[in-house]
Amino acid sequence: AIVFIKQPSSQDALQGRRALLRCEVEAPGPVHVYWLLDGAPVQDTERRFAQGSSLSFAAVDRPQDSGTFQCVARDDVTGEEARSANASFNIKWIEAGPVVLKHPASEAEIQPQTQVTLRCHIDGHPRPTYQWFRDGTPLSDGQSNHTVSSKERNLTLRPAGPEHSGLYSCCAHSAFGQACSSQNFTLSIADESFARVVLAPQDVVVARYEEAMFHCQFSAQPPPSLQWLFEDETPITNRSRPPHLRRATVFANGSLLLTQVRPRNAGIYRCIGQGQRGPPIILEATLHLAEIEDMPLFEPRVFTAGSEERVTCLPPKGLPEPSVWWEHAGVRLPTHGRVYQKGHELVLANIAESDAGVYTCHAANLAGQRRQDVNITVATVPSWLKKPQDSQLEEGKPGYLDCLTQATPKPTVVWYRNQMLISEDSRFEVFKNGTLRINSVEVYDGTWYRCMSSTPAGSIEAQARVQVLEKLKFTPPPQPQQCMEFDKEATVPCSATGREKPTIKWERADGSSLPEWVTDNAGTLHFARVTRDDAGNYTCIASNGPQGQIRAHVQLTVAVFITFKVEPERTTVYQGHTALLQCEAQGDPKPLIQWKGKDRILDPTKLGPRMHIFQNGSLVIHDVAPEDSGRYTCIAGNSCNIKHTEAPLYVVDKPVPEESEGPGSPPPYKMIQTHHHHHHHH
């Protein structure tokens, strides 16, 4: 037999909260347990589901869980079935609702002195108790002509008067909880003696010297009073008007007329209505003076044919908001088509060259009109007037490459040389018409040039080559004065270039032929062994067929190169003593001697009393000081060559003699003079 150990029992439950109906079964064999609700099987959901043999509720729901639950246990083998006792929920709930008008049937029927009943549509179980509020203040029974019962959901106002006007709300509470009205009710019962607005004044915008009218009307029983005030609370009446409102007229119907409005009339006007009872009603309206500012300038615009472009017109600041329109050639643009106005924008679709011209944006309001022009250029791809031509330019002269094009707007021309952009400098100049000038053509200017002419619509380019026609010139020009060392081998080079490879030959300036030991080998004059007679003037002649000949004159001097007879030596001198640095050189022409001390040339005219350079070239320094220490260089030079040799000078302190030493005692160390020296020649 199937036995219920635990049976479900009826119980209180809270709406939306958890609950559990228990059921436990004992049987000899396996049994299948399921639940019935009002006789129908219960299907598991997320909210309500079997938990073992019991039935669990995640959130009790009044509509779905009202009824009788029963636990059924069935032995599927024997077919035996047992049913538990019935169980149900006493569901406690509360649900908000609106405050509604119960009597009279519609708001339109509410009149002073009629009975008004409001109903609070908050329901619940157990039945809640109700509390009413007007404008948030609780109402208690028996006060101010109204009836309210906490158990009753109705509020009765008998009779209803203006004092009952306000926002009515209700709240209810029970064992389950509390709820307040989801929608409140505004009761409005007019007091005929209160001023009521019939016509309210509106803000107005007027142009200077125009007129402005404010309308204002109130109604009440008995009729209300009406008063106009301006800004600073100055009353406006037909009898007493402030000076700045002397053109104001108040009409019997309450309207206020201002004529020939000035800036000082702008401001806030207040219309005040006062009934026999109730508060004054204050209505405000503002008088604005119309104004319009200037429009910003447009930048000229460049568009390309076939594109779609827009030009936005920023309307000027103004009151009232200025209206904006576009015109072209004196005709207002339509709102559709190929060239049209859209909002404040000028739209040009599929631009044609004929669309170029001046377009005008107009803006206007009561204060006046403003306009601004925009110049629209329709760009065209450049076309050639004159392409750059392959050119042969002469070295040393200015060269020109044309790049003449035409387009709208005026095209910009840039030049490239060896694929590199040419930036204008002292050698290159690009004229306004696009022509490139090479100020002084050089051999390496012979290369490829490319010019590119561009507008926003596109660009064209062309290339040209430059062949430089070389000057006939010496490369490098021979030195006009040159020296050769007597009794030695010598060479004097001369080379030249031209459009054709030049022939080079040497001549003696006096026309005499070169001696047999002097040879002229492709421009190099070679002296096997220089003699005194080889000195003199020589001419190098370079010539070719197309360019003729050029000459360079060279004066050759035969010299005995410089040698030093005496060289300065490493010298150490006591401070305060005299140092002698000897230097003697020989050569032809006779060399001159110069001294350099501490990296600066010692100028004989500015040596001062302590230093002197002798005729033979020796340098003497009297009363030497430590700062005289350093390297001294003897430089021997003549018109043919220069040679130098150097030696260091050391200045040391003189030792102080000890008492035991007599006046004739030898110094504690010897003065060392080494004979190392270095010499160089140029």
Partner: antibody, heavy 120, light 107 residues
Framework: EVKLLESGGGLVQPGGSLKLSCAAS????????MSWVRQAPGKGLEWIGD????????NYTPSLKDKFIISRDNAKNTLYLQMSKVRSEDTALYYC?????????????WGQGTSVTVSS | ETTVTQSPASLSMAIGEKVTIRCITN??????MNWYQQKPGEPPKLLIS???GLRPGVPSRFSSSGYGTDFVFTIENMLSEDVADYYC?????????FGSGTKLEIK
């Protein structure tokens, strides 16, 4: 007498590199523009590029610009073509040419060419 | 890049006949067209340089004409030694571009 003698050709694998030389004589090499032209077997001529006397201007045909480098050594009177990333379509006879004038553009001296074969 | 279209690709002519080869460019190159002759196993030889200029030593039976985009190379009386490939070369702009060549044979 102007002479241009190309060398350095031969068999090279795809993706490999090769440096061609052109020894010039009989003219002042340091004063002239030079160029390279190639000819695939049984096909037409293709200009590779040219180079000015001091190497400050080098021009290439765009399709070869990233593969080939033209250079020169005026002291050695030699023009070079450095080939890299070679493919089978680079198989050709490579000519070195002397441009005696830029205006008119006169490629009137050509070497006998050196053959390059690209094959794996 | 200027492309050069050369026609015909091959030509078979009798000795003494007039030979005409045409090159058309896709851009205006003024008169910067050159004409080369290449005999089997030899490098190309410049016959006519820019501006329809006949090179020194080239026989006067060779000539050229044209300006802009259309160019014609003519051999007035063909000789057997004229059997060769002929190429046009535009030198107006970089890169320089050759025509595809015309093979001239004896009929």
């Amino acid at each position: 007498e102007v002479k241009l003698l190309e060398s350095g050709g031969g068999l090279v694998q795809p993706g490999g590199s090769l440096k061609l030389s052109c020894a010039a004589s009989g003219f002042d090499f340091s004063r002239y523009w030079m160029s390279w032209v190639r000819q695939a077997p049984g096909k037409g001529l293709e200009w590779i590029g040219d180079l000015n006397p001091d190497s400050s201007a080098i021009n290439y045909t765009p399709s070869l610009k990233d593969k080939f480098i033209i250079s020169r050594d005026n002291a050695k009177n030699t023009l070079y073509l450095q080939m890299s990333k070679v493919r089978s379509e680079d198989t050709a006879l490579y000519y070195c040419t002397l441009i005696t004038t830029l205006v008119p553009y006169t490629m009137d001296f050509w070497g006998q060419g050196t053959s390059v074969t690209v094959s794996s | 890049e200027t492309t050069v279209t050369q026609s015909p690709a091959s030509l078979s002519m009798a000795i003494g006949e007039k030979v005409t080869i045409r090159c058309i460019t896709n851009t205006d190159i003024d008169d910067d067209m050159n004409w080369y002759q290449q005999k089997p196993g030899e490098p190309p030889k410049l016959l006519i340089s820019e501006g329809n200029g006949l090179r020194p030593g080239v026989p006067s039976r060779f000539s050229s004409s044209g300006y802009g985009t259309d160019f014609v190379f003519t051999i007035e009386n063909m000789l057997s030694e004229d059997v060769a490939d002929y190429y046009c070369l535009q030198s107006d702009n970089l890169p320089l571009t050759f025509g595809s060549g015309t093979k001239l044979e004896i009929k």
